[in-house]
């Protein structure tokens, strides 16, 4: 489908001359025909901002140790998270790691494992928590 160009501008470092007033809206990309935009294909590609791209960005496929938190739409990339029982610290590129099964002796669990953090344990006699 061909849709009208956006007249809103967005900063872009890729180009020496940012084509202001020629940007396509989120969920679409530039056509090979000047002045036209093509819609992204749901589940295949996306653009999350006004853009001058000649194709939508490819949707990310979740890794084998991850599950889909939210699917790729024409305006938002796939969101992936670690599968239950595994976690990865925020902003880390490492593989998902198994959650700890329990706290060390003398400590008690105060927080369950989430896809983003391991269980949290605190000393029985103190209120100060720390990750292990």
């Amino acid at each position: 489908a061909t849709i009208k160009l956006h007249d809103q501008s967005i900063g872009t470092q890729q180009w020496e001359h940012s084509p202001l007033g020629e940007l396509c809206p989120p969920g679409s990309h530039r056509s090979e025909r000047p002045g036209a935009c093509n819609r992204c294909t749901e589940g295949v590609g996306y653009t999350n901002a006004s853009n001058n791209l000649f194709a939508c960005l490819p949707c990310t496929a979740c890794k084998s140790d991850e599950e889909e938190r939210s699917p790729c739409t024409t305006t938002r990339n796939t969101a992936c998270q670690c599968k239950p029982g595994t976690f990865r610290n925020d902003n880390s590129a490492e593989m998902c790691r198994k959650c700890s099964t329990g706290c060390p002796r003398g400590m008690v669990k105060v927080k369950d494992c989430t896809p983003w953090s391991d269980i949290e344990c605190v000393h029985k006699e103190s209120g100060n928590g720390h990750n292990i």
């Epitope: 890729q14 020629e22 090979e32 025909r33 000047p34 002045g35 194709a55 960005l57």
Partner: antibody, heavy 118, light 111 residues
């Protein structure tokens, strides 16, 4: 049949500029984006940037920023590519090509040999 | 150094089939189906032979076919003919909104 016809060969000194032209016939000049590419002797192809013939805006990779200018004269259906501050490694055949519907280039101009030599 | 990797040369006899590979990354060949192949005879401009991985423009022989697996695209020419002898270049659109090419493969038709 769409045809892209380019200007003739040029010999330039280092530090000079060159302006290559590309005349489109057989279809509307403004129907598709125009791209510029080059090929050094015995080497592969290198993409230099895109040009919007309606608005006159252009985009090029970082490597050519500040050195390449793409313009047009719609009255004669001609696009131009000017490369400044020429060096010996700019010696190449320069091509214009139209953007095909699938992010490909088709057809191409016949090429313009630019030789940079002192 | 080209962004996409192709073998420098391949050869085959008339009637045989040959395959030329083109290896990139997730950001180009692996990220999109916008892979093209161009044929270039000496002293001539490149000619589009395959677009979108496996589509032939009208007028291109069905002896030319394309495929892709992961980050590697391939061009296969079956029933080799003398005038297939040329340089072949692969190209891909990239997630950086640019185009990259392979270094080219010289095809020699023996005999």
């Amino acid at each position: 049949e769409v045809q892209l016809v380019q200007s003739g060969a040029e010999v330039k000194k280092p530090g000079a500029s060159v302006k290559v032209s590309c005349k489109i016939s057989g279809d509307s000049f403004t129907a598709y984006f125009i791209h510029w590419l080059r090929q050094a002797p015995g080497e592969g192809l290198e993409w230099m940037g895109w040009f919007n013939p309606i608005s006159g805006t252009a985009g090029s990779p970082q490597k050519f920023h500040g050195r390449v200018a793409m313009t047009r004269d719609t009255s004669i259906s001609t696009a131009y590519m000017e490369l400044t501050r020429l060096a010996s490694d700019d010696t190449a055949i320069y091509y214009c090509a139209r953007q095909h519907h699938s992010n490909t280039f088709d057809p191409w101009g016949q090429g313009t040999l630019v030789t940079v030599s002192s | 150094q080209s962004a996409l990797t192709q073998p420098a040369s391949v050869s085959g006899s008339p009637g045989q089939s040959i395959t030329i590979s083109c290896t990139g990354t997730n950001s180009d060949v692996g990220g999109y189906n916008y892979v093209s192949w161009y044929q270039q005879h000496p002293g001539k401009a490149p000619k589009l032979m395959i677009y979108e991985v496996n589509n032939r423009p009208s007028g291109v022989s069905n002896r030319f076919s394309g495929s892709k697996s992961g980050n590697t695209a391939s061009l296969t020419i079956s029933g080799l003919q003398a005038d297939d002898e040329a340089d072949y270049y692969c190209s891909s659109y990239t997630t950086s909104n640019t185009w990259v090419f392979g270094g080219g493969t010289k095809l020699t038709v023996l005999g």
